[in-house]
């Protein structure tokens, strides 16, 4: 566990940018940062989930733009930004600090934000180290900062993965060895048994696997039951001589302001009260006016510090502060190999070759998952395909209604009527047949073939 | 990083023989569809044939004019894509690409190999 | 075979002018369609694939829309490094076929 501190020196018009404030005849504003931490140096969708953290700052001083004059450095808050996290630092992350501003006028429904810049870094960095400086343009705007990773103890290294004590301390817990002298770093715990429980298990001497009070088995994964005592071997209280149950990562309940904890592998999880936020629930008293509905999400009420808000989360989000990200390509909606690709307003598939349709459902290449409509038949050929089809309808997948008069079928001046099932010749006198082609002898005789029985000539004609 | 490389262009008579080599590497060869496109000088692009993947068949389809003429063929063991032709004619004069066709669409490309037919 | 055609041929246009490029198919193809760019002398690069997608990495002044028969290829603000010949392709069936590609320039 650690934290991420960002110190925003100053944000103003870069050489050559903005001339003037862009406040201009908006009366006072302010600004405040949101910074999101994410993990990996990839190139990631804009609004993929802070996965390593988010925190926002304090409101800036007021500041009032003087009509023709220069636009300064603005007004900035007061203090660090920091980020919690509570895992390994990754040492690749992507920095994204937002540069908001709140407009102070008299708006209708409260303060107005608009985004007046936003830069991304990727960046490597361990943790512990210095404090890294920077100064990145977005359009007009400079924005100079300095930003460390820090661990808290017991963790500690570039990755505060290794877990110390000060040398003062009586015992060390499991796992740990006191820190040597003036060093940052600790010893190396023994290699315990494989599969050695990281929670309820630890070793003095490598190889074995050692239990903490209420754990108990070969790896430490059983918990010990403590309704009876009987038989039980092990630690065990020294009033009672049952096993004690070994502490957990909620034990005294890490969550403030009445968050309920949850625990989680090697950790914890706080699930906060409506108003109330951050990695155990410490960011108190917040509204509507602090941003805090992350993604894009939409903050209601909370118009004060003592009523509560709430988040309506864009789809693909959720969370109290629309801070999770649904997995929706977990559903595995895309056919035949195809990538998903959850773009936050919707899913995309991209299908591979071969495949195609808004879940890859249609072969492009043979008729296997080609579905041609109302009767059409799909015929393929040299890795091709097309629908022939029915009469009365046309397209590439024969939805479309075709007028099967267009073509004038009739001949000899007979009238053509569209049929459900196709079309119909109502021959003019003298013709017969199913297109009105055959000329009708005076005797009633066709020139070629008959006419079918009860078919007397004039008589409508379906062609099916 | 995904790399296609052609080898095997050059000059070549009317009615001779030419076999075009590419090897890829940077992804799981044996896995992609694989084709060829080439551009004759100053013109546009004309897709001359592809390859399936073996797993989804490792059938081969042709452009018209070179059908009968030209046979695309993969070694997955040495992620080489190989193009024989035969039969050339001055019209095939052109520089030909070796594409990735995983995705709908010719993704990578190599930096071409010309091929001249002249008598 | 669907035959691909493109317009105009050819364009000059002012750095920071927005500059369109149509493409018809002669059948439908619904959104089967790419478009390349490709520099002098160099191989063609994917910009849009299934007509309106950008491919990664690609900046997001390239644009690709229509369905159908008619599509439209966009750059909102023409750069210097946009000077190229732009392809549209169907892989609708097969042969896959090109347009005849239109060369930008820079007036």
């Known amino acids: 566990a650690g934290v991420f501190e960002l110190q925003i020196h100053s944000f103003g018009p870069g050489p050559g940018g903005a001339p003037r404030s862009p406040y201009s005849a908006r009366g006072p504003c302010r600004l405040f940062f949101r910074v999101c931490l994410k993990p990996g140096l990839s190139e990631e969708a804009a609004e993929s989930p802070c996965a390593l953290g988010a925190a926002l700052s304090a409101r800036g001083p007021v500041y009032t733009e003087q009509p023709e004059a220069p636009a300064p450095d603005l007004p900035l808050p007061n203090g660090l930004l920091q980020v919690p996290f509570r895992d390994a630092w990754p040492g690749t992350f992507s920095l994204i600090i937002e540069t908001w501003r709140e407009e102070l006028g008299d708006q209708i429904g409260g303060p107005a934000w608009s985004l007046l810049a936003r830069v991304t870094r990727r960046r490597r960095l361990a943790a512990g180290g210095p404090w890294a400086g920077d100064i990145q343009r977005a359009g007009a705007w400079e924005l100079r900062f300095s930003y460390r990773a820090r661990c808290e103890l017991p963790a500690v290294g570039t990755a505060c993965t290794r877990l110390c004590r000060p040398r003062s301390a009586s015992r060390c817990g499991p796992g740990l060895r006191p820190c040597a002298p003036l060093e940052d770093e600790c010893e190396a715990p023994p290699v315990c048994r494989a599969g050695c429980s990281l929670e309820h298990g630890f070793c003095e001497q490598p190889g074995e696997c050692r239990c903490l009070e209420g754990w108990t088995g070969p790896l430490c994964m059983v918990p010990v039951s403590t309704s009876s005592c009987l038989g039980l071997r092990g630690p065990s209280s020294t009033t009672t001589g049952c096993l004690v149950p070994g502490p957990g990562p909620c034990d005294g309940n890490p969550c403030a302001n009445g968050g309920s904890c949850s625990e989680t592998p090697g950790s914890f999880e706080c699930t906060c009260p409506r108003g109330f936020y951050g990695l155990r629930c410490e960011v108190s008293g917040v509204t509507c006016a602090d941003g805090p509905c992350f993604n894009g999400g939409l903050c209601v009420g909370g118009a004060d510090p003592d009523s509560a808000y709430i988040c309506h989360c864009p789809p693909g989000f959720q969370g109290s502060n629309c801070e999770k990200r649904v997995d929706r390509c977990s559903l595995q909606p895309c056919r035949n190999g195809g990538l998903c690709l959850d773009l936050g307003h919707a899913l995309r598939c991209r299908c591979r070759a071969g495949f195609a349709g808004p879940r890859c459902e249609h072969d492009l290449n043979d008729c296997a998952g080609r579905a041609c409509a109302n009767g059409g038949t799909c015929v393929e050929g040299g890795g091709a395909h097309r629908c022939s089809c029915a009469l009365g309808f046309g397209g590439r997948d024969c939805r479309e209604r075709a007028d099967p008069c267009a073509a004038r079928p009739c001949a000899h001046g007979g009238r053509c009527y569209a049929h459900f099932s196709g079309l119909v010749c109502a021959c003019a006198p003298g013709y017969m047949g199913a297109r009105c082609e055959f000329p009708v002898h005076p005797d009633g005789v066709s020139a070629l073939p008959a006419a079918p029985p009860g078919l007397r000539p004039g008589d409508p004609q379906r062609y099916p | 990083e995904v790399q296609l490389v052609e080898s095997g262009g050059g000059l070549v008579k009317p009615g001779g023989s030419l076999r075009l080599s590419c090897a890829a590497s940077?992804?799981?060869?044996?896995?992609?569809?694989m084709s060829w496109v080439r551009q004759a000088p100053g013109k546009g692009l004309e897709w001359v044939g592809r390859?399936?993947?073996?797993?989804?068949?490792?059938?081969?389809d042709y452009a018209a004019p070179v059908k009968g003429r030209f046979t695309i063929s993969r070694d997955d063991s040495k992620n080489t894509l190989y193009l024989q032709m035969n039969s050339l004619k001055t019209e095939d004069t052109a520089v030909y690409y070796c594409?990735?066709?995983?995705?709908?669409?010719?993704?990578?490309w190599g930096q071409g190999t010309l091929v001249t037919v002249s008598s | 075979d669907i035959q691909m055609t493109q317009s105009p041929s050819s364009l000059s246009a002012s750095v920071g002018d927005r500059v369109t490029i149509t493409c018809q198919a002669s059948?439908?193809?619904?959104?089967?369609l790419n478009w390349y760019q490709q520099k002098p002398g160099k191989a063609p690069k994917l910009l849009i694939y299934?007509?309106?997608n950008l491919e990664t990495g690609v900046p997001s002044r390239f644009s690709g829309s229509g369905s159908g028969t008619d599509f439209t290829f966009t750059i909102s603000s023409l750069q210097p490094e946009d000077i190229a010949t732009y392809y549209c392709?169907?892989?609708?069936?097969?042969?896959?076929?090109f347009g005849g590609g239109t060369k930008v320039e820079i007036k």
């Open positions: 594409t990735q066709y995983y995705w709908n669409s010719f993704d990578y």
């Open positions: 940077g992804f799981t060869f044996s896995n992609t569809w």
């Open positions: 390859i399936k993947s073996k797993s989804d068949g490792g059938t081969t």
């Open positions: 059948q439908d193809i619904s959104n089967y």
């Open positions: 299934d007509a309106s």
């Open positions: 392709q169907q892989y609708d069936n097969l042969p896959l076929t």
